[in-house]
Amino acid sequence: QNASRGRRQRRMHPNVSQGCQGGCATCSDYNGCLSCKPRLFFALERIGMKQIGVCLSSCPSGYYGTRYPDINKCTKCKADCDTCFNKNFCTKCKSGFYLHLGKCLDNCPEGLEANNHTMECVSIVHCEVSEWNPWSPCTKKGKTCGFKRGTETRVREIIQHPSAKGNLCPPTNETRKCTVQRKKCQKGERGKKGRERKRKKPNKGESKEAIPDSKSLESSKEIPEQRENKQQQKKRKVQDKQKSVSVSTVH
């Protein structure tokens, strides 16, 4: 803001001179600038208890430039506004107010929320998540072999994090019980994850325990500790179905 204060030289009518310094067009000893040269804005500058006229190339914070034929002035923004484009369009609000469509509000309107960083009213953003990724292989202590009960997991990503008033994200991790493929672990296979076995897909939204296909059960060679009679197998299947569990992690 380039300010110029006037000093009277050539007297016009009482207290008015045109022989002024800097940006003043007319000035007086007592009041400083009375009017400004083209494109400059008149403003009152407080010096102690006194206000004197100055001519500025741009208006200070809290003011905007008004232009009328041959007379420009810095005009105050509204009381709740820090910087403005004109009287009716604020671009930055004072502390405690939120900017919305050029206005400063105590509270944001319905459907919007206050962003305390930008001090603006913004749209409420709800959480968005991706589709579930496929289930991981069924493992027990990192092993994908041996006829034992294990777990499998699937995950999905957060595409859009919610804003303060937005809907929270649903679980992004899901774990369920499953049965490890009935096959003998090879020597170097301990802890090594195998390919995901074939299984029936659970219904959408369900998280059922996986039961091996009859084909895969038949084709796998039994080893002594895994041997069970048909009656025991049947009984176990029923119990496991009742115990089906889904573990979720909420974000």
Epitope: C33, P69, K76
Partner: antibody
């Protein structure tokens, strides 16, 4: 001492044009802002517009379509024309001047001229 | 347009009395306010500009104050010659606008 003096007809017929002159002495109309103000019978004052030192004009929105302020720098005079007058335009018309925001507004006034709009 | 609400619209006061006339703007006018006195058959005379600056030759019993939207003119000790109509004027924004006036009469 700056002096302003209004002149023109005191009676104008409805739908006609009101024309007034303001003659300025003690200052040049090529400096400052030269205005017309009117005072209605109920004592209400209304600023009508101005002509600037460069000859640019400003008119209040309610009169913009029918008002005109012009000047003759060689005579140091400026003029008011108000078209399509009605009885509502009956008022005392003043010319007045100011030199900018930092000084007194309308520090100098003419004595005023009463214009009656009547058939 | 900025509306200037002036009060009272008329008043009677005794000589030597302290008189206050107020003007309220419809929005903040940032001290761009003048006061005028008009006597019957005369043109208005500027008393005060920029809220509190007295025009040369105006008696010191006249004073102005205010900020934001609220402004006042005070006559400290009323004299007979002070009777007339008083107007406020805002010139913060065009069109500049006057108050409706306060008629001051002596009791």
């Amino acid at each position: 001492e700056v002096q302003l003096q209004e002149s023109g007809p005191s009676l104008v017929k409805p739908s006609q044009t009101l024309s007034l002159t303001c003659s300025v002495t003690g200052d040049s109309i090529t400096s400052g802002y030269w205005s017309w103000i009117r005072k209605f019978p109920g004592n209400k004052l209304e600023f009508m517009g101005y002509i600037s030192f460069s000859g640019k004009t400003y008119y209040i929105p309610s009169l913009k379509s029918r008002v005109s302020i012009t000047r003759d720098t060689s005579k140091n005079q400026y003029y008011l024309q108000l078209n399509s007058v009605t009885t509502e335009d009956t008022a005392t018309y003043y010319c007045a001047t100011y030199h900018g925001y930092g000084g007194p507004w309308f520090a100098y006034w003419g004595q005023g001229t009463l214009v009656t709009v009547s058939s | 347009d900025i509306k200037m609400t002036q009060s009272p619209s008329s008043m009677y006061a005794s000589l030597g009395e302290r008189v206050t006339i107020t003007c309220k703007a419809s929005q903040d006018i940032d001290s761009y306010l003048s006061w005028f006195q008009q006597k019957p058959g005369k043109s208005p005379k500027t008393l005060i500009y920029l809220t509190n600056r007295l025009i040369d030759g105006v008696p010191s019993r006249f004073s102005g104050s205010g900020s934001g939207q609220d402004y006042s003119l005070t006559i400290n000790s009323l004299e007979y010659e002070d009777m007339g109509i008083y107007y406020c004027l805002q010139y913060d924004e065009f069109p500049v606008t006057f108050g409706a006036g306060t008629r001051l009469e002596i009791k």
